[in-house]
Amino acid sequence: YDFTNCDFQKIEADYLRTISKDLITYMSGTKSTDFNNTVSCSNRPHCLTEIQSLTFNPTPRCASLAKEMFARKTKATLALWCPGYSETQINATQAMKKRRKRKVTTNKCLEQVSQLLGLWRRFIRTLLKKQ
């Protein structure tokens, strides 16, 4: 799947209206200087690919973000504005049900969420450049 056929304006609107607020709430209590993240994405579909990677897949310090409010809203937004996206998620939902529930220490995930904020900001910037 690639994100080429998504409605990027609608995704931007959803991000600015809700997802961004949830990400900032998750990061509350941290300073922007706490994480030295150099994240980049080259265009709008690529930004969404990177966002998909870091929102719904484990990394070494953060086992899962999928149940966080911003992740649920991200999934809903992509399902709504990216044709065919929902079909890619069926196996993932089934796989998640089989998986053991694991306790995640929130602060271990802060760096990754900081990376996500950077990716979303780049997504918005690439959108502005195209207009």
């Epitope: 994240v39 980049s40 690919t49 990177e50 990677s53 870091l54 897949n57 196996n91 993932a92």
Partner: nanobody
Framework: EVQLVESGGGLVQPGGSLRLSCAAS????????LYWYRQAAGIERELIAS???????NYVDSVKGRFTISRDNSENTMYLQMNSLRAEDTGVYYC???????????WGQGTLVTVSS
Amino acid sequence: EVQLVESGGGLVQPGGSLRLSCAASGSGFGVNILYWYRQAAGIERELIASITSGGITNYVDSVKGRFTISRDNSENTMYLQMNSLRAEDTGVYYCASRNIFDGTTEWGQGTLVTVSS
């Protein structure tokens, strides 16, 4: 489906360096998130490094600053540069490729790294 083959393991002295490679064949490597795992004797396999298609990296605390994960999508290869190796880095290193949408994961067969004087 992606098939993965690791190489580059071996015996190295404490403080030394090694570079592991993970060569992929098949489709899907380009957008998948890639991982290096380590399994020491009697210990559960541990995720130590990850890299997205665009090169965003994350590391477990114990290897941060010493190990560097990288990927070359044109060559379908991932690397793990390991510096300042310690005895506790000994183990079998596995590469893995995970579909970012449905979570299906392919594994390599592993390569043994032994850090000993």
